[in-house]
Interface confidence: low
């Protein structure tokens, strides 16, 4: 496939009643559209038995399953039934294949792992495949930001990434917040940054043929505390259909420690805002950042009173900062083919 | 217009404690911050603690006052308390009662940047 390429199955016919099953190998980055049945009366799309939202990233609409830029988690098996029978129309798995091509940083597509690959001759030693993303060697960031260094590479067979720290094996467990390593991606990704994660940073791919190294000095500048950041757009406006689960995202970066609060913009008396001028809310969550998972807000089965104005609100020892998004609840598609078939519902 | 009647202040010993209480009163929101503030002589005005209306346990502190001063408020009595135990000679100053609403829909700021009213000091004396 070429990366301008998506995956389609055209046109948007009505298929035949005996459908094979199908595999489909999908890179990561690609964009997907599947037809199933007339897209006036197109089958209702699910996944692994959940049946898909019209609505989200992955989302199954008149017909169509599309997943805006697939995921290895969107990995698996599709059906298409007809609406209002249990007739299979499409039955498909799709399978995690390599990253397309692109500029965007995250994504080698040069450099994967190709397990058709692996022992076939002749055998090359490691090499990197994009040297010129390897140039800054020094890195002198902030205190508080994100950090990655990346080493792509290839070789055959296809060699395997290591980290050192200071020239000591570097797993990560001795900092707060640990480390990611994205071996597809050959990074090494950390978060919050601290003037004790300064050092030398030597990315070290071998195989049977051979090892390259390369070194990385990351220099960690102090700075001044500061009232929590929110990232911008976050969290972000968002449309589902009554019955699905919705996700809102609040992404805070603070040197003191954070408190933070999820509020639900309310009406009391037919007004959102009190005599003063200041909306009313309803506290949904609050707790702060050391919690699980308190940066997001969970929704499950969601209603049309759900719908409205949510805010984010993190607060520090130097300040506040609070950013908010819509709920926008849709009413569910196909009322009658809920009713047909009461265990699916909607996952998004 | 919101009027904060702050008292509790005194003279108390290095390792003596003291309450301060701020109430407020007038047109006052329900979506509020109200916290402390305080002013050493020759200094700049600087943040000590507060408190959300809707979060009754959670305070935020300055980092030199945390784990010796506790913040709480009574919405009912729109009342905020701030128990300072632990006193040290540099916690002297006075100390300013402080009211903030949020803006609409986001914002952010420094403590001070979110103050709408302030009320009059108490002092604060911790000497042997």
């Known amino acids: 496939l070429e990366a301008s390429e998506e995956v389609e199955l055209e046109p948007c016919l009505a298929p035949s009643l005996e459908q094979q099953e199908q595999e489909l190998t999908v890179a990561l980055g690609q964009p997907v559209r599947l037809c199933c049945g007339r897209a006036e009366r197109g089958g209702h799309w699910y996944k692994e038995g959940s049946r898909l939202a019209p609505a989200g990233r992955v989302r199954g609409w008149r017909g169509r399953l599309e997943i805006a830029s697939f995921l290895p988690e969107d990995a698996g098996r599709y059906l298409c039934l007809a609406r209002g029978s249990m007739i299979v129309l499409q039955n498909l798995t799709l399978i995690t294949g390599d990253s397309l091509t692109s500029s965007n940083d995250d994504e080698d597509p040069k450099s994967h792992r190709d397990p058709s690959n692996r022992h076939s001759y002749p055998q090359q030693a490691p090499y990197w495949t994009h040297p010129q993303r390897m140039e800054k060697k020094l890195h002198a960031v902030p205190a508080g930001n994100t950090v990655k260094f990346r080493c792509p590479a290839a070789g055959n067979p296809t060699p395997t990434i290591r980290w050192l720290k200071d020239g000591q094996a570097f797993h990560g467990e001795n900092r707060i917040g640990g480390i990611r390593l994205r071996h597809q991606h050959w990074s090494l990704v950390m978060e919050s940054v601290v003037p004790s994660d300064r050092g030398t940073y030597t990315c070290l791919v071998e195989n049977a043929v051979g090892s390259i190294r390369y070194n990385y000095l990351l220099d960690v500048l102090e700075r001044s505390p500061h009232r929590p950041i929110l990232q911008a757009g976050l969290p972000a406006n968002t449309t589902a259909v009554v019955g699905s689960d919705v996700e809102l995202l609040c992404k805070v970066y603070s040197d003191a420690q954070p408190h933070i609060q999820w509020l639900k913009h309310i009406v009391i008396n037919g007004s959102s805002f009190g005599a003063d001028g200041f909306p009313y809310v309803q506290v949904l969550k609050t707790a702060d950042i050391n919690s699980s998972e308190v940066e997001v807000l969970y929704l499950r089965n969601v209603s049309a009173e759900d719908a409205g104005e949510y805010t984010c609100l993190a607060g520090n020892s130097i300040g506040l900062s609070y950013q908010s998004a819509w709920l926008t609840v849709l009413p569910e598609e196909d009322p009658t083919w809920t009713a047909a078939a009461p265990e699916a519902r909607y996952t998004d | 217009e919101v009027q904060l009647q702050a008292s509790g202040g005194g003279f108390v010993q290095p390792g003596g404690s003291l309450r301060l209480s701020c109430a407020a009163s007038?047109?006052?929101?329900?979506?509020?911050?109200m916290g402390w503030f305080r002013q050493a002589p020759g200094k700049e005005r600087e943040f000590v603690s507060a408190?959300?209306?809707?979060?009754?346990?959670?305070?935020y502190y300055a980092d030199s006052v945390k784990g010796r001063f506790t913040i709480s408020r009574d919405n009912s009595k729109n009342t905020v308390y701030l128990q300072m135990n632990s006193l040290r000679a540099e916690d002297t100053a006075t100390y300013y009662c402080a009211y903030a609403s949020y803006p609409r829909h986001q914002g952010n700021g420094r403590w001070k940047d979110f103050v709408e009213y302030w009320g009059q000091g108490t002092q604060v004396t911790v000497s042997s």
């Open positions: 007038g047109r006052t929101s329900w979506l509020t911050t």
């Open positions: 408190i959300s209306s809707f979060s009754s346990k959670q305070g």
